[in-house]
Amino acid sequence: SEAEDASLLSFMQGYMKHATKTAKDALSSVQESQVAQQARGWVTDGFSSLKDYWSTVKDKFSEFWDLDPEVRPTSAVAA
């Protein structure tokens, strides 16, 4: 039926969106190790790359995020 087709299409669109994001995260992780070796771009003491820096920061900060399940940012209304 048309309803079933629409439901299947919606499911597939959601699946593809999730798959794309998963792939982006996976590629990003691979990229991180490559960047760590190159160590170019931003510079600081104790971190091999900017990506390494952010990964460390957000992991350490996760305990505060876990205290607040509402992680969506709030912007000033654009309108």
Partner: antibody, heavy 122, light 108 residues
Framework: QVQLQESGPGLVKPSQTLSLTCTVS??????????WGWIRQSPGKGLDWMAV???????YYSPSLKSRTLISRDTSKNQFSLQLSSVTPEDTAVYYC??????????????WGQGTLVTVSS | QPVLTQPPALSVTLGQTAKITCQGG??????AHWYQQKPGQAPVLVSY???SRPSGIPERFSGSGSGATATLTISGAQAEDEGDYYC???????????FGGGTHLTVL
């Protein structure tokens, strides 16, 4: 509600050091965001990241500015600051302090200060 | 050449749909974020992580990403949507955070 307010001189002479402070109200800089930073906007170069300081005090700098930039924080005053040394007219820009967020990469600026115009001129 | 490329200007008729693009090879592996900036004001986050919208942002703003292109779509553009729009992501090495050159949106 967290708010950011930049403060500092509007005019700086060439070769001097520019010092800016961002005062955060409505939440602690140690617990309300993973990191804070400075971004500047100049007519010729658009928006540029300058430096970032995390909730735990660790810092990161843009490569093009690393040699003359220092970011620091004062948790007792709930402030973080930027120092840019040996300024030239090319450093003339609107300087924004920012609150960073995001569990993915790269992070985004979830909140900006109002911005402060700094002119470098003799 | 900028790491993230945006069209300098775009015009849209009131009530119509505007699509602002941001192109860069790094967008294949890094998320894109979008900011709106009105004259004399600080930028405002209107979309993050490719397609997420901050609370407080009207539903007419939506982001999407496909391959090396990120797109901000404004469905039913309003007069108050006029301004500059910037995309932000990482460069191809992943080791620098960069902004696009900005797109000035005019609502006719």
């Amino acid at each position: 509600q967290v708010q950011l307010q930049e403060s500092g001189p509007g005019l700086v002479k060439p070769s001097q050091t520019l010092s800016l402070t961002c005062t955060v109200s409505g939440g602690s800089i140690s617990t309300t965001a993973p990191a804070w930073g400075w971004i500047r906007q100049s007519p010729g170069k658009g928006l540029d990241w300058m430096a970032v300081i995390a909730f735990d005090g660790s810092a990161y700098y843009s490569p093009s500015l690393k040699s003359r930039t220092l970011i620091s924080r004062d948790t007792s005053k709930n402030q973080f600051s930027l120092q840019l040394s040996s300024v030239t007219p090319e450093d003339t820009a609107v300087y924004y302090c920012a609150r960073l967020g995001g569990r993915n990469y790269p992070p985004y600026v979830e909140l900006w200060g109002q911005g402060t115009l700094v002119t470098v001129s003799s | 050449q900028p790491v993230l490329t945006q069209p300098p200007a775009l015009s849209v008729t009131l009530g119509q749909t505007a699509k602002i693009t941001c192109q860069g090879g790094s967008l294949r592996v890094s998320y894109a974020h979008w900011y709106q900036q009105k004259p004399g004001q600080a930028p405002v986050l209107v979309s993050y992580d490719d397609d997420s919208r901050p609370s407080g942002i009207p539903e007419r703003f939506s982001g999407s990403g496909s391959g090396a292109t990120a797109t901000l779509t404004i469905s039913g553009a309003q007069a108050e949507d006029e301004g500059d729009y910037y995309c932000q992501s990482a460069d191809s090495s992943g080791d620098n955070w960069v902004f696009g050159g900005g797109t000035h949106l005019t609502v006719l």
